[in-house]
Amino acid sequence: VEVKVPTEPLSTPLGKTAELTCTYSTSVGDSFALEWSFVQPGKPISESHPILYFTNGHLYPTGSKSKRVSLLQNPPTVGVATLKLTDVHPSDTGTYLCQVNNPPDFYTNGLGLINLTVLVPPSNPLCSQSGQTSVGGSTALRCSSSEGAPKPVYNWVRLGTFPTPSPGSMVQDEVSGQLILTNLSLTSSGTYRCVATNQMGSASCELTLSVTEPSQGRVA
């Protein structure tokens, strides 16, 4: 049995229904069997867990996803073995295996792999600060969302109408969410907002930076 699956990875928003397309061509016999299984990201195929079986004319959902899995066509004997997974969770991200067996059709191994990513908006990020906050010193502002798929990009902006710091004294890394401020001055003080963004949305946090004279010590 030769199984056909999309070559492109599949992306489905959190809470929506994922349709994992799997088709095949074979003269379906009574021994026809379909198995869908799941592998977590980074794990080998050998560690897959079954989520649905079809055999002897009956459908058997199994495992932790059993209440949420079904087939687009039941019985899946018309050449369409497409899986529907409702109310997708972040833990549904991974590789799905569609395997069709129909002895004596051993033309190929009857296996197709589909990568699913569940799209999750960024959670409210946590803003933090470390370093020397006195004039002339340097500080790092950090921003991180615990959730978000694809991984959010981070953008820091300074609120208000204060003079803009010179470009060399304000460097940010959109991937790590870190903003490094060097050669601090009193005018560096103010409120800084970090916005975490991905294709599903955005979330933000704010942090107030207080730059002091060296003799006054470090105040956050």
Epitope: E2, K4, T23, S25, T26, V28, G29, D30, G79, D105
Partner: antibody, heavy 118, light 107 residues
């Protein structure tokens, strides 16, 4: 030598019923998916029913679904097509065909003519 | 349902000619295509399956090619026995459907 011989065709009134038979020989019938394919006079070919090797799975196009029933008796190496609620547009030569490992038709019978007319 | 469209409907040719018949599918059917030959009053005969595979006993002058949505049947040198009607059929997902046929007649 593979042989498929259809029988049971004839003249039937609209709304009537007919049962076609196909006697198979020359191959292991119980290992083969089977189908019925029809051809209206002067027209092309249309697949009308299929059945799996042991009879567990049957399939039909929308044009005959609910009216036609395919079945088989592996002990007799025979295939059947029960046709109910016949319409004028069901008039055709009906062929019995063996499916390959994939669903193409590698052997065909000589056909039996079904005429639906009042 | 997947629609199969053949062209031309009729083709006039002479013995020895190279003949090409086209079959188009309304959606991707990969290589799941079969070709049949039918003579008047006779049952169809399988010529090609999986777009290009010839069953045992089919003369090598017949060849098939294509994948996706566009397919061709070629007869490299037409013989007197080849005047007939040719049908394509997809063998992908049910319902399996045929093209409307191409009649190859003597010029």
């Amino acid at each position: 030598e593979v042989q498929l011989v259809e029988s049971g065709g004839g003249l039937v009134k609209p709304g009537g019923s007919l049962r076609l038979s196909c006697a198979a020989s020359g191959f292991t019938f119980s290992n083969s998916g089977m189908s019925w394919v029809r051809q209206a006079p002067g027209k092309g070919l249309e697949w009308v029913a299929s059945i799996s090797d042991g009879g567990l799975y049957t399939h039909y196009p929308d044009s005959v679904k609910g009216r036609f029933t395919i079945s088989r008796d592996n002990a007799k190496s025979s295939l059947y097509l029960q046709m109910n609620s016949l319409r004028a547009e069901d008039t055709a030569v009906y062929y019995c065909a063996r499916q390959g490992v994939q669903p193409f038709f590698d052997y065909w019978g000589q056909g039996t003519l079904v005429t639906v007319s009042s | 349902d997947i629609q199969m469209t053949q062209s031309p409907s009729t083709l006039s040719a002479s013995v020895g000619d190279r003949v090409t018949i086209t079959c188009r599918a309304s959606e991707n059917i990969y290589s799941y295509l079969a070709w049949y030959q039918q003579k008047p009053g006779k049952a169809p005969k399988l010529l090609i399956y999986n777009a290009e595979t010839l069953p045992e006993g089919v003369p090598s002058r017949f060849s098939g090619s294509g994948s996706g949505t566009e397919f061709t049947l070629t007869i490299s040198s037409l013989q007197p026995d080849d005047f007939a009607t040719y049908y394509c059929q997809h063998h992908y997902v049910i319902p399996w459907t045929f093209g409307q046929g191409t009649k190859v007649e003597i010029k």
